[in-house]
């Protein structure tokens, strides 16, 4: 394809560009402590960092967004770092009938890209 | 569910929160003028605006990201406004054998959410 390809080396320096980072959070932090029982502490992978021109572009839209941001920065925002995929996790819930194991498919990020 | 639901009214005032906006761009703007023949001018819908707490949350991850951003703003970024779906468009290409019509599924945003 004649498209510019998304690049993977960060021109801003190590750890500055869009990447996955682990954030520890308690059920209290999430406001879930009255209905999730366990685990009380979660390891949440989140997408953080900047999206310089064509870095990890999610798709064609993200590539043109990056280009137009360069031309019209006040009108078109830069792409931003968001999850490209998720890792399922299981939490123990308090329910009316007791306790159940519930899967969350969209809670913890597994990969990131610039969209 | 006991989750806080994504909200749809913008607390920042009209037009300030994440929404779809049309941006006009030429093939020259996109750097495509040597291999796309037509149309020369594109109407590109893009996602712009802010993502205040729980506004149009894409999923559970976005909800907890919003919450953790409130608690640890230096460590966890706020959710940002990105496409939730796309509208396919057809462009006319110059090829080695002449001209062809090519569909782009991920060029023009159709809806936006906060991720």
């Amino acid at each position: 394809s004649a498209h510019a390809h998304p690049r993977d080396s960060c021109p801003l320096g190590p750890g500055r560009c869009c990447h996955l980072e682990t954030v520890q959070a308690t059920l209290e932090d999430l406001g879930w402590s009255d209905w999730v029982l366990s685990p009380r502490q979660l390891q949440l992978s989140m997408c953080v960092g900047e999206c310089p021109h064509l870095y990890r572009s999610a798709n064609t839209h993200a590539q043109i967004k990056a280009r137009l941001h360069g031309l019209q920065p006040d009108k078109v925002p830069a792409p931003c770092c968001v999850p490209s995929s998720y890792t399922p996790v299981v939490l123990m819930h308090r329910t009316d009938s007791g306790v159940s194991l519930q899967t969350y498919d969209d809670l913890v990020a597994r990969g990131c890209h610039c969209a | 569910s006991a989750h806080a639901h994504p909200r749809d009214s913008c607390p920042l005032g009209p037009g300030r929160c994440c929404h779809l906006e049309t941006v006009q761009a030429t093939l020259e703007d996109l750097g495509w003028s040597d291999w796309v023949l037509s149309p020369r001018q594109l109407q590109l819908s893009m996602c712009v605006g802010e993502c205040p707490h729980l506004y149009r949350s894409a999923n559970t991850h976005a909800q907890i990201k919003a919450r953790l951003h409130g608690l640890q703003p230096d460590k966890v970024p706020a959710p940002c406004c990105v496409p939730s779906s796309y509208t396919p468009v057809v462009l006319m290409h110059r090829t080695d054998s002449g001209v062809s019509l090519q569909t782009y599924d991920d060029l023009v945003a159709r809806g936006c959410h906060c991720a």
Partner: antibody, heavy 119, light 107 residues
Framework: QVQLVQSGAEVKKPGASVKVSCKAS????????INWVRQAPGQGLEWMGW????????VYAQKLQGRVTMTTDTSTSTAYMELRSLRSDDTAVYYC????????????WGQGTMVTVSS | DIQMTQSPSSVSASVGDRVTITCRAS??????LAWYQQKPGKAPKLLIY???SLQSGVPSRFSGSGSGTDFTLTISSLQPEDFATYYC?????????FGGGTKVEIK
């Protein structure tokens, strides 16, 4: 490092009760649940139930309901499993194990406590 | 309750062999399957969790795959210390249930 240390072997008569302890160290006891699993001689693993150390909520295996009680003492980071009305087929090694974690992992196990039920 | 069926119940193999153990759930359990190794007189040891994630400190010759109802544990090159009994376990829903075990013996 994370450890679960269980109480010593017990010999009980049919109809009696036994209470096995499991002391946790190396992590925040109230962050995770504790499972109890038993294994009769030469047999496979049988899950008995689960307790969350934080709130004391429990889930018990149907076949043990009414005979088993799981408790925790957060001041000493210790979990307990009491089994009443013992029968000879309750003779087994009883294990405590931490979890499930957010990836459904039951990752750290106690060394096991042998309970023999014999007249 | 979800039944977990392991096969074979025993396997004879030599050092260096590739060994595959399968586990079938009576209903879908997503990827919430773990594999344990147990040696005589010892507590079970977690090898694989979430169907394919290798527990910290476990040698890379152990691998897991599968989702839904069918799962596999593979030992790529059997070592002397791998002769043991292996159990699968589901944690998709309570009650948590284990497979019947597979004994890996020296040929």
């Amino acid at each position: 490092q994370v450890q679960l240390v269980q109480s010593g072997a017990e010999v009980k008569k049919p109809g009696a009760s036994v209470k096995v302890s499991c002391k946790a160290s190396g992590y925040t006891f109230t962050d995770e649940g504790i499972n109890w699993v038993r294994q009769a001689p030469g047999q496979g693993l049988e899950w008995m139930g689960w307790i969350t150390a934080y709130s004391g909520d429990t889930v018990y295996a149907q076949k043990l309901q009414g005979r088993v009680t799981m408790t925790t003492d957060t001041s000493t980071s210790t979990a307990y499993m009491e089994l009443r009305s013992l029968r000879s087929d309750d003779t087994a090694v009883y294990y405590c194990a931490r979890g499930p974690g957010q990836y459904a992992d039951v990752d750290v196990w106690g060394q096991g406590t042998m309970v023999t039920v014999s007249s | 309750d979800i039944q977990m069926t392991q096969s074979p119940s025993s396997v004879s193999a030599s050092v260096g062999d590739r060994v595959t153990i399968t586990c079938r759930a009576s209903q879908g359990i997503s990827s919430w399957l773990a594999w344990y190794q147990q040696k005589p007189g010892k507590a079970p040891k977690l090898l694989i969790y979430a169907a394919s994630s290798l527990q910290s400190g476990v040698p890379s010759r152990f691998s897991g795959s599968g989702s839904g109802t069918d799962f596999t544990l593979t030992i790529s090159s059997l070592q002397p210390e791998d002769f043991a009994t292996y159990y699968c376990q589901q944690a998709n829903s309570f009650p948590i249930t284990f497979g019947g075990g597979t004994k890996v013996e020296i040929k």
